[in-house]
């Protein structure tokens, strides 16, 4: 039961995390105009990965997409790539984890296959979360560097009187959404990996002994069945298979690779 809960919770946490990564990637507020210690303007600037926006105090907002690929900073391209990779891996991980969920029965899928899928999705979630955290952190670092450079320009008066007001940018809401979402995806992935350990049938518990009788052969396995069958006394295996939606007939009609005849 604990394994099912861990797997289910890992899936839900990862789902929320990936939704957050998608939201952060689409958000326009990756960087917002720094209002502290600046002249009060009637115009507010903010920028995303895909477009930059200007909100006037009149309420009019204008957004312009970055309609160039080659003209964009390499760092911005790298952040975009990291976020997209994170989303793609997360989406694939979600797809895999749906089939791996213990509460969902798909055909004759073995528990070892579910364990492998759970581990795969867990790893994908971990990498997805790391990609998002890395992407957001790279962007944040870029902002910090530019912030202090523009502050230095402001106070040292480099290059004399410039024709544009030095607009400084600080952390936008999308960065915090990205960090939290990346963290949640990472946590979800770790939970899936932990659940996988509980799902995977241990070799020592499945070393069945074959007794050859005349005319037919029967395999006796210690544990591995639901408690109601009365077979075996291995509490660990009972715990794992408790709550499973299988009947005794199902177990018998779909032998696994651990059944030795």
């Amino acid at each position: 039961m604990a394994v099912t809960a861990c797997q289910g919770l890992g899936f839900v946490v990862s789902l929320i995390g990936i939704a957050g990564i998608i939201a952060a990637t689409c958000m326009d507020q990756w960087s917002t105009q720094d209002l502290y210690n600046n002249p009060v303007t009637a115009v507010f600037n903010y920028q995303g990965l895909w477009r930059s926006c200007v909100r006037e105090s009149s309420g009019f907002t204008e957004c312009r997409g970055y309609f160039t690929l080659l003209g964009l900073p390499a760092m911005l391209q790298a952040v975009r790539a990291l976020m997209i990779v994170g989303i793609v891996l997360g989406a694939i991980g979600l797809l895999v984890s749906i089939f791996a969920l213990k509460c969902i029965r798909i055909g004759s899928m073995e528990d070892s296959a579910k364990a492998n899928m759970t581990l795969t999705s867990g790893i994908m979630f971990i990498v997805s979360g790391l990609c998002a955290i890395a992407g957001v952190s790279v962007f944040a670092n870029m902002l910090v560097t530019n912030f202090w450079m523009s502050t230095a320009n402001m106070y040292t008066g480099m290059g004399g009187m410039v024709q544009t007001v030095q607009t400084r940018y600080t952390f936008g809401a999308a960065l915090f959404v990205g960090w939290v979402a990346g963290g949640l995806t990472l946590i979800g992935g770790v939970m899936m990996c932990i659940a996988c350990r509980g799902l995977a049938p241990e070799e020592t518990n499945y070393k069945a002994v074959s007794y050859h009788a005349s005319g037919h052969s029967v395999a006796y396995k210690p544990g591995g069945f639901k408690a109601s069958t009365g077979f075996g006394s291995n509490t660990k295996n009972k715990k794992i298979y408790d709550g499973g939606a299988r009947t005794e007939d199902e177990v018998q009609s779909y032998p696994s690779k651990h059944d030795y005849v």
Epitope: V43, V54, S58, G59, F60
Partner: antibody, heavy 118, light 113 residues
């Protein structure tokens, strides 16, 4: 069409207060900021402040801070400008205006003459 | 506060001739976010409220004749009336729409020579 109708002329004594109203029509009252601009006789234009009728948020010219209060009544779709501690130099025509894109003022009230005299 | 300096104070131009009004800001009104200059031009006739002519330094308001044009960027701006008409006699104001408080220039009176 968009119209901003202001209250009539006022004559006040120094130290008194005046409250000028501005009733816009022809658009959704809460969708645009209302600004107040004054013009002393034979002088130029001076921005006093602005209010967002939807949220009630205000921004003031520091020159008038503490003396001017901008309010908006959504139920009657009317904006108000109250100027206290009146002085003779406050004698001017007070305009309300609608703020649009570019933070510019596209529609103006007809103006309200406030005369401060002892 | 941003100081808006208009020149000349008054201008006499013959009908059909070009009239040019200058406006200088103490700080740049160019917003780096959208590369727009937050400067507006108004026309005010005696006994009337001001009328919006041009916003974003060069965008003509709908209904404004195309003989009115705005140009300039950063700190220096110009309003040009390509062919002065009798109805253009008025006082013209520039306004900073970027920094609070929103300040106006002193005005330029345009008359017919």
């Amino acid at each position: 069409q968009v119209q901003l109708v202001q209250s009539g002329a006022e004559v006040k004594k120094p130290g008194a207060s005046v409250k000028v109203s501005c009733k816009p029509s022809g658009y959704a009252f809460t969708n645009y900021l209302i600004d107040w601009v004054r013009q002393a006789p034979g002088q130029g234009l001076e921005w006093m402040g602005g209010i967002n009728p939807g949220s009630g948020d205000t921004v003031y010219n520091e020159k008038f801070q503490g003396r001017v209060t901008l309010t908006a009544d959504k139920s009657s779709s009317t904006a108000y400008m109250e100027l206290s501690s009146l002085r003779s130099e406050d004698t001017a025509v007070y305009f309300c205006a609608r703020r649009v894109r570019g933070n510019s003022f596209d529609s103006w009230g007809q103006g309200t003459l406030v005369t401060v005299s002892s | 506060d941003i100081v808006m300096t208009q020149s000349p104070d008054s201008l006499a131009v013959s009908l059909g001739e070009r009239a040019t009004i200058n406006c200088k800001s103490s700080q740049s009104l160019l917003n780096s976010g959208n590369q727009k200059n937050y400067l507006t031009w108004y026309q005010q006739k005696p006994g009337q409220p001001p009328k919006l002519l041009i916003y974003w330094a060069s965008t003509r308001e709908s209904g404004v004749p195309d003989r009115f044009s705005g140009s300039g960027s950063g700190k220096d701006f110009t309003l040009t009336i390509s062919s002065l008409q009798a109805e253009d006699v008025a006082v013209y104001y520039c306004q900073n729409n970027y920094f609070y408080p929103l300040t106006f220039g002193g005005g330029t009176k345009v008359e017919i020579k």
